[in-house]
């Protein structure tokens, strides 16, 4: 649960200035599609893929609708992808859900997770 202690710890790690990441990816006009595919961190690319899938799965993002979609988002694709996806969702589901509910773009959500450090590992 999101306890007061969690907030205190998290606040301690937040800088006062706006958080930003040096990501190179750009989204299309709808905020949905990755239009440039530079060398991105594996987790960042995973994040973008999952968030974009979730956006397509829900008509309107609410805590309930995104949470329901989150239980199905990893079910499609190869088993290796399913494992990567499930691992990502275990760590970040609540934050991804909150970002989607608030109307953040996929890029904003994934940058806010600080996942955009380039990585040479495969997806």
């Amino acid at each position: 649960r999101l306890s007061p202690e969690y907030y205190d710890l998290a606040r301690a790690h937040l800088r006062d200035e706006e958080k930003s990441c040096p990501c190179l990816a750009q989204e299309g006009p709808q905020g949905d599609l990755l239009t440039k595919t530079q060398e991105l961190g594996r987790d960042y690319r995973t994040c973008l893929t999952i968030v974009q899938k979730l956006k397509k799965m829900v008509d309107k993002p609410t805590q309930r609708s995104v949470s329901n979609a989150a239980t199905r988002v990893c079910a499609t694709g190869a088993s290796r992808w399913a494992d990567v996806c499930a691992n990502f969702m275990r760590r970040y589901q609540s934050r991804v859900t909150q970002g989607l509910v608030a109307g953040e773009t996929a890029q904003q959500i994934c940058e806010d997770l600080r996942l955009c450090i380039p990585s040479t590992g495969p997806l």
């Epitope: 998290a10 606040r11 805590q63 989150a70 953040e104």
Partner: antibody, heavy 123, light 111 residues
Framework: EVQLQQSAAELARPGASVKMSCKAS????????MHWVKQRPGQGLEWIGF????????DYNQKFKDRTTLTADKSSSTAYIQLTSLTSEDSAVYYC????????????????WGQGTSVTVSS | DIVLTQSPASLAVSLGQRATISCRAS??????????MHWYQQKPGQPPKLLIY???NLESGVPARFSGSGSRTDFTLTIDPVEADDAATYYC?????????FGGGTKLEIK
């Protein structure tokens, strides 16, 4: 100190429009969505909708969608609500309230409210 | 829409006694392990003030006399012991589903 300063009371004719403002200070404007809540005299609270200043995303209560427009100006940390085709049913106090985009920014609820703007619709 | 029904609509409690306010949702307001239910206090001529968020978390600066409990559809705000300054109207509010909704309010009078 967090403050949400709302514009002065409005007196309007039926059929007219009003635009109210909510100027935020004391926090990072883009980390919070701005919500609007209506309260008719002696009545309860009704959620109108919210705007995300980061992305421009808006989410409206269907009941208010047709005659309400929410906007925000990041440069001045100000949110606006415009009501059109006013009727006597729109006579109420309108509150703005902030809500964190992510739960590590603060309590995941509307934690600070403006003082309210009173709108009176009368011929 | 999720309908929030508060009871009682009003109550009078003696100074130093316990006040209990109930909020029942027409459907569950729980998602991914959290109950998206919050409690606010409103005094005449003032905006609402956040007391409890996510069903049971006490907002900073709010006295520990206030507590919240519950999950899914049944929630409770408890004030123990009640003080004179607690005379106000209390609202529950959910944001699990659109549109966000408030309960009808409970007016607390101190005897």
């Amino acid at each position: 100190e967090v403050q949400l300063q709302q514009s002065a009371a409005e007196l309007a004719r039926p059929g007219a429009s009003v635009k109210m403002s909510c100027k935020a200070s004391g926090y990072t404007f883009s980390r919070y969505t701005m919500h609007w809540v209506k309260q008719r005299p002696g009545q309860g609270l009704e959620w109108i909708g919210f705007i995300n200043p980061n992305s421009g995303y808006t989410d409206y209560n269907q009941k208010f969608k047709d005659r309400t427009t929410l906007t925000a100006d990041k440069s001045s940390s100000t949110a606006y609500i415009q009501l059109t085709s006013l009727t006597s049913e729109d006579s109420a106090v309108y509150y703005c309230a902030r809500h964190p985009i992510y739960s590590d920014y603060g309590p995941y609820a509307m934690d600070y409210w403006g003082q309210g703007t009173s709108v009176t619709v009368s011929s | 829409d999720i309908v929030l029904t508060q009871s009682p609509a009003s109550l009078a409690v003696s100074l130093g006694q316990r006040a209990t306010i109930s909020c029942r949702a027409s459907e569950s307001v729980d998602s991914y392990g959290n109950s998206f239910m919050h409690w606010y206090q409103q005094k005449p001529g003032q905006p609402p003030k956040l007391l409890i968020y996510l069903a049971s978390n006490l907002e900073s600066g709010v006295p520990a006399r206030f507590s919240g409990s519950g999950s899914r559809t049944d929630f409770t705000l408890t004030i123990d012991p009640v003080e004179a300054d607690d005379a106000a109207t209390y609202y529950c509010q959910q944001n699990n589903e659109d549109p966000w909704t408030f309960g009808g309010g409970t007016k607390l009078e101190i005897k």
